[in-house]
């Protein structure tokens, strides 16, 4: 049961992060031209 809840929580967090990234309209990539 605990494992299931942990899995559910992890998936929820991943979905939330994905939604926020998608709605931000930004390329959340890091700089590749210099070592920022």
């Amino acid at each position: 049961m605990k494992r299931f809840l942990f899995l559910l929580l992890t998936i929820s967090l991943l979905v939330m992060v994905q939604i926020q990234t998608g709605l931000s309209g930004q390329n959340d990539t890091s700089q590749t031209s210099s070592p920022s």
Epitope: G25, Q26, N27, D28, T29, S30, Q31, T32, S33, S34, P35, S36
Partner: antibody, heavy 114, light 111 residues
């Protein structure tokens, strides 16, 4: 879509001052070192000023040709970078790009002439 | 400062033929994190520069695979397998390992 919009260029007399501004969008601005790159027929493309991240205490670096005359700054809350230029010379004439090198805008033209 | 020397300064080509541009650095561009910050830009006539290649050989999004970057340390090359009309312009190498410096540019023009 990534956008970089430079503004503030124009005609200024030798010895005068000018401040360039740049607004960025479409990428995580506060993760990128930002630069002002000048393009002129004489010197081609040259990076004249660089500003790093908050985690680097906004460290700056300048080309010898502008050291002591130009100051770069940034405002991460506005995704903006600025270039304060004092004691301008004829050789400062050119197109000024605000760029992380990864992405480029259209630039703003500065002409220093009497 | 790191000096980048590009050759040739002008390259006259025929559409459909290959092209190659060299960029040599005065110092190694290998950074302490193991990455080499060597980029290639294209500036088409009347336009601002656009990056094509980063980290020596990685193509930016939307860049055709006829472009290829290679090299290490101080010697780098940009190759176009078959030149197309849209490839004409000035190519610049630019390093980001120690404060950005640019090559003088190579003008790719029609023969």
């Amino acid at each position: 879509e990534v956008k970089l919009e430079e503004s503030g260029g124009g005609l200024v007399q030798p010895g005068g001052s000018m401040k360039l501004s740049c607004v960025a969008s479409g990428f995580t601005f506060n993760k990128y070192w930002m630069n002002w790159v000048r393009q002129s027929p004489d010197k081609g493309l040259e990076c004249i000023a660089q500003i790093r991240l908050k985690s680097d205490n906004y460290a700056t670096h300048y080309a010898e040709s502008v050291k002591g005359r130009f100051t770069i700054s940034r405002d991460d809350s506005k995704s903006s970078v600025y270039l304060q230029m004092n004691n301008l010379r004829a050789e400062d004439t050119g197109i000024y790009y605000c760029t992380p090198i990864d992405y480029w805008g259209q630039g703003t033209t500065l002409t220093v002439s009497s | 400062d790191i000096v980048l020397t590009q050759t040739p300064r002008t390259l006259s080509v025929t559409i459909g033929q290959p092209a190659s541009i060299s960029c040599k650095s005065s110092q190694s561009l290998l950074y302490s994190n193991g990455k080499t910050y060597l980029n290639w830009l294209l500036q088409r006539p009347g336009q601002s520069p656009k990056r094509l290649i980063y980290l020596v050989s990685k193509l930016d999004s939307g860049v055709p695979d006829r472009f290829a970057g290679s090299g290490s340390g101080t010697d780098f090359t940009l190759k176009i397998s078959r030149v197309e009309a849209e490839d004409l312009g000035i190519y610049y190498c630019v390093q980001g390992t120690r404060f950005h410096t640019f090559g003088a540019g190579t003008k790719l023009e029609l023969k």
